[in-house]
Every structure is written in C-alpha cells, then in structure tokens.
C-alpha cells in the first residue's frame, strides 16, 4: 500500500487537526527544550508543507519518507548545539541513523521546572481567548515532559482538556468544577505516561518477541472467547501501532491504532461482548475504550491443558515444528483461563514451560521427562500470591503514606547507590499499589498489583540507565522483563555499600516547610528517612520510627509557633543531635 | 491426591428444594472452574452450572432461574442451590474442579425428585 507522498497520505488520512497536533508532540518529544514558539512555527511550516503536497502529490521533496521531512525541519533549529550539545551531532547523520540518533537522546527526566496551575480564572481566560493555542500549549508541556507518551492517547487527553475547560468556565463555581477534572487528567496522564514507557521499554531493549508475548497474555485475558488466530491478529497489529509510537512514527502510529479500532469494532463477534460501547463513540474515545475494556466472560466448560500440553504424545513434535506458535498457543490457552494472574506471571509460566521442553524433547524419554512440568507452576504462582497477601496486609494495618515509607526503607537498603529523588518517586509510586489494588476482590488483585509494580520498577529502570550507579538494579533490569519484579523483591540489604557520611544539611528545616501542602511535607520527610537510611542501613524498623516520629512533632510544634524560624533553628540542632543518639 | 466428597443429595418433592456440597481435599491450585454436571439414567453426562475464576456463572438453559452455583475461595468449596425442583432434575450430580493440569470428579450424589 505505497503512496507517492507519504505526508500527503498521513495528512488526508488523520485530518488536519489531528496531523498538526501529532507533529506537534513529534517535535515536543524530539526537543524538548526548545520554547512552545519554536515548535508551532515548525508545525506551521510542516502543515503548510503537507497541504502542497495534498495538492499535488509529485511537487518538490513530497516523495521524502516521514523521517527525512522531519529530521531536516528539526534540524533547522539554530540554538540546536548550545541547548542541545551532542544531540546536534544527530544532524550530520542519514537517515535512519539520523532519527535513530534523535530516538536515543530522548530524555526520561529532562530538566523542566514542575507544571504550575495558574489560577482558574486565569486559564479560563486563557482558554477564551486562544483556545486552539492553550491546547497546543497543553500537548506541548506534556510531551515534552513525557517524550514517549502514546501520541494519539495523548490526543484523547487533550480532547478531554478542552471539555473540562469548555464546561467548567461556564459553571457558577468554576474551581470546583473544574479541579477535580484536572486532578484525574494529570493522575490518568502520569499512569498512561508509564505504562506507555514500559511498552516501549519492552520493545526496544528485548525486542518484539517480548512484546508480542506480553500482547498474547492480556489479550487472551482479555478476550477469552476469541479464537488463538484473532488473537494473534490483534497482537500482530498492536505490535505495528506501538513500534511505530515508540519509534517516533507518530503519523503511521495514529493512523493504524484507528484502522485497529475499525477492525476491533467490525469484528466484535468474533472477538469480545464487551466491545459494543466503545465501538459507538467517536475514534480518539472509540480507541482509548478498546485499550481499557474489561475482561469479557471466560467460556463456560474449557478443559485442562493438561491433554494437548504434557499427555499428548506429539508434544514434542508440535513444539520442534513451530516453537513460537506452539509456545503462543500455550499462553494464549493458560491466560484465557487466568484473568486472575499478573500477565507477567503468565509470562513466567510460558518461560518455565519452554525451558522444561527444550531440556525434555532432547531427552531420552521425553514424555517422562515433562510429566511433571505443571506441578514446577506451583511455586511461581504462590509467590507472587503470597507477596500480594502480605503487602495488602501491611497497607491495612499501616495506611497508605506509612506503608510508603516502608518500603522506602526496604528499597533504600536493597539499593542503597540510587539517588533520594529516584528512590522517594518510585518508591512513592510502589506504595500507591495498596490504595489501587488491595480494595479489588481477591481474582483482580495480583493482575493489578503486579502489572503495576511491573510499570513503577520500569520507571526505575529507566531513570538508572541514563545514571548507572548499581550493579544490582543493572543486573535486575537487563537480565529478564518478566523477572523484574522478583528480582528487586529477592533483593537484600546491600552489604557491601559504605554507609554515606551525615551532613546536618541534609536535615536541617526551615518555616517554609509549614506552608508546603501534604503532599510536598510528606516528601520532604520521605527525602530525610531515605538519607537517613543511607547514613544508618543497619537501623532497625523501631529507631527510624522513633526518628520519624520526633520529625514530625519538631515539625508540628514549629510550625505552631508564633516565630517559626526562630523555632526551626533552636529545635533543628536539637533534633538532629536526638536522632544521632537513637540511631547510634 | 485430590478427591472431591459431593454432599446434600436425597428424595425431595416436586416443587422442594436442596443444597448440594462438594469439598476438595488434598493439594489443588490455580483453579479455573468449578462446575455440577449430572447424569440421568440410560442419558449423557450434561453440564448443569459452572463458575469460573473471574466470577462468571452459566447455567443449562432448564435450570435457569431455579438452580445457583456459588464457591467458597477459601475453602476449596462448590455449592449448588436447587430450588423448584422437578422430576426431569431426577440424576447422579457430579461437582468438577480443574486447573490446568487436571479436572477432578467426584463420585456423584443421587437426586431423586418424587411424590
């Protein structure tokens, strides 16, 4: 299906607004220093470019491939060097070295000041008077903030910015409306944000093979009525859609997620009951549905997998003839019956079958040989079951922020190198775990709990590569995707770290803590118990809640007082001094 | 070894009601489906309900809003309430667990529906 201009193609395929807003986080997430200005101008003049070509097809340069269009108008940027430094050198490069080259600057943590929320009739104002312009803004500082944020997701959001916007400005009480909208987009933005990342993770640092299997697991999950064959088409073509958003290909990306929703919605039969409601909303609502669609019903009276998989003679015959079909086959069966199962334990088992037949089909008695091979399942499916259990417990008995703060500590101790802020954020994130998971009834908890850990160990994966600092969290990270998770959880106290030197510094407070809202008070003594953690690894449970506890009333008390700094001052020192006692 | 003990079959009336039970012991994870077949005389094993792990129910279109199947997690538990009872539900009901490497039966239990 070639096409003389491929930019003409895109353009008449998406629409004009949906083309200038994906280049738009094209560019943002290439770039993501350079001033909104820059890039609209960019947009401008590559939309400006795409309608020539619309028009006629053959004109100048219409017949360059996405890349180059782009790459050239990219590198066009005159402060590249100086803002950029040796992402420059990118520009030197042919395509597809060149946007290669572009893929691999992306920065996971760029060095952008925190969003901040304008008053609301500031924005309302804003909106008002340049609506189309306040959206740009709105895809702008989230793609670059996120640079592999699922670009047609990204514009569903802000499909549902405007429409918060465009009502809530309108409403007798605007904040009220409105703040609760932008609170659940900016929550819902942060998850898709990564779990979009660990998609892309998969694919680029262990190949498609990995995202195919993950696609066959939650989609059989999914859709346990459909047959192997339509799940293997919907996870080929997923597995197109999210190589091109995580190669940058965002046009090609957005344009098959909608062919996708298209066949989805033409073949529900065949497919899933639960599609019908999404398959009549409009396409950005229509494709987001079918991502998020829960799992249908299982079909009533399958059997155990124990004829085709360990008592049928052909076992080995069937695996030599087409492994990855085979082994497919198996998933797909095992994961349609276990919508209770974390897809990376499904994953686990798939793994732990495929070893189990490479070693048995070379063995004398093969059949013997594997007999067994579901009865080896038993100590992978109790482990994860028994870690949910334990952790729903603690975050039971200890609520949400404690339960965070326990896990700070058994994390900072596993890997004691990381920096505060990576081990406070993901540790923060860990803990989140309790209030999404623990709630849900028994058969929904380990996929929840353990997929979700899967994306906030992801985010700590990624935000280590680009500072190594551990050999251990390098060694969890490479070794094995699905493995990801025990590996952290097997973690010890890292005994061959040298306690960090005390700095009083680090724990000394100023009033400025007592205007800080919850949430930034709970991090700043989140910051204090990890470097407290990292002085003293060795700390009991009971020390540092004893340290804890006497932060928080030295906290309280100043900011009770009628001079605070003058309390934070004389009270600091004393604290300190209290807390080195305790913890000696 | 798994076994599964049926129980809370007997004579019943047209119209009455019973509860069967059935209990496994011994070492039985990841189960998938629990289910109640029964089997008439001189006729084929049917499937009466089943539940499956996510919580979903199916019924034999002839016991639809008379019989209801629930499951104890906990205890490795399957339930079958049978309500209006007629003289055609007359059959051995068997309960059947599987996980993935098995389905495991019980021996059966004798409902007898007379006047």
């Known amino acids: 299906d070639t096409h003389k201009s491929e930019v003409a193609h895109r353009f008449k395929d998406l629409g004009e607004e949906h083309f200038k807003g994906l280049v738009l986080v094209a560019f943002s997430q290439y770039l993501q220093q350079c001033p909104f200005e820059e890039h609209v101008k960019l947009v401008n003049e590559v939309t400006e470019f795409a309608k020539t070509c619309v028009a006629d097809e053959s004109a100048e340069n219409c017949d360059k491939s996405l890349h180059t269009l782009f790459g050239d108008k990219l590198c066009t940027v005159a402060t590249l060097r100086e803002t950029y430094g040796e992402m420059a050198d990118c520009c030197a490069k042919q395509e597809p070295e060149r946007n290669e080259c572009f893929l691999q600057h992306k920065d996971d943590n760029p060095n952008l000041p925190p969003l901040v929320r304008p008053e609301v009739d500031v924005m309302c104002t804003a909106f008002h008077d340049n609506e189309a312009t306040f959206l740009k803004k709105y895809l702008y500082e989230v793609a670059r903030r996120h640079p592999y944020f699922y670009a047609p997701e990204l514009l569903f959001f802000a499909a549902r910015y405007k429409a918060a916007f465009a009502e809530c400005c309108q409403a007798a009480d605007k904040a009220a409306c409105l703040l609760p909208k932008l609170d659940e987009l900016r929550d819902e933005g942060k998850a898709s944000s990564a779990k979009q990342r660990l998609k892309c993770a998969s694919l680029q640092k262990f190949g498609d093979r990995a995202f195919k299997a993950w696609a066959v697991a939650r989609l059989s999950q999914k859709f346990p009525k459909a047959e192997f064959a339509e799940v293997s088409k919907l996870v080929t073509d997923l597995t197109k859609v999210h190589t091109e958003c995580c190669h940058g290909d965002l046009l090609e990306c957005a344009d098959d997620r909608a062919d996708l929703a298209k066949y989805m919605c033409e073949n529900q039969d065949s497919i899933s009951s639960k599609l019908k409601e999404c398959c009549d909303k409009p396409l950005l609502e229509k494709s987001h549905c079918l991502a998020e669609v829960e799992n249908d019903e299982m079909p009533a009276d399958l059997p155990s997998l124990a004829a085709d998989y360990v008592e049928s003679k052909d076992v080995c015959k069937n695996y030599a003839e087409a492994k990855d079909v085979f082994l497919g086959m198996f998933l797909y069966e095992y994961a349609r019956r276990h919508p209770d199962y974390s897809v990376m334990l499904l994953l686990r088992l798939a793994k732990a079958y495929e070893a189990t037949l490479e070693k048995c089909c070379a063995a004398a008695d093969p059949h013997e040989c594997y007999a067994k091979v579901f009865d080896e399942f038993q100590p992978l499916v109790e482990e994860p079951q028994n870690l949910v259990k334990q952790n729903c417990e603690l975050f039971e008995q200890l609520g949400e922020y404690k339960f965070q703060n326990a896990l700070l500590v058994r994390y900072t101790k596993k890997v004691p190198q990381v920096s505060t802020p990576t081990l406070v954020e993901v540790s923060r994130n860990l803990g989140k775990v309790g209030a999404k998971c623990c709630k849900l009834p028994e058969a929904k908890r380990m996929p929840c709990a353990e997929d979700y850990l899967s994306v906030v160990l992801n985010r700590l994966c990624v935000l280590h590569e680009k500072t190594p600092v551990s050999e251990k969290v390098t060694k969890c990270c490479t070794e094995s995707l699905v493995n990801r998770r025990p590996c952290f959880s097997a973690l010890e106290l890292d005994e061959a770290y040298v306690p960090k030197a005390f700095n009083a510094e680090t724990f000394t407070f100023h009033a400025d803590m007592c205007t800080l809202s919850e949430k930034e008070k709970q991090v700043k003594k989140q910051t204090a118990l990890v470097e407290l953690v990292k002085h003293k690894p060795k700390a009991t449970k009971e020390q540092l809640k004893g340290v804890m506890d006497n932060f928080a009333a030295f906290v309280e008390k100043c900011c009770k007082a009628d001079d605070k700094e003058a309390c934070f001052a004389e009270e600091g020192p004393k604290f300190v001094a209290a807390s080195q006692a305790a913890l000696a | 070894q798994v076994q599964l003990v049926e129980s809370g079959g007997g004579l019943v009336q047209p119209g009455g009601s019973l509860r069967l039970s059935c209990s496994a012991s011994g070492s039985i994870w990841g189960i998938y489906h629990m289910g109640w077949y029964r089997q008439a005389p001189g006729k084929q094993r049917e499937l009466v309900a089943s539940i499956t792990v996510d919580g979903s129910t199916h019924y034999a279109d002839t016991v639809k809003g008379r019989f209801t199947i629930s499951r104890d997690n906990s205890k490795n538990m399957v339930y079958l309430q049978m309500n209006s009872l007629e003289p055609e539900d007359t059959a051995v009901y068997y309960c059947?667990?599987?996980?993935?490497?098995?389905?495991?039966w019980g021996q059966g239990t004798q409902v007898t529906v007379s006047s």
């Open positions: 059947d667990i599987r996980n993935v490497g098995g389905d495991y």
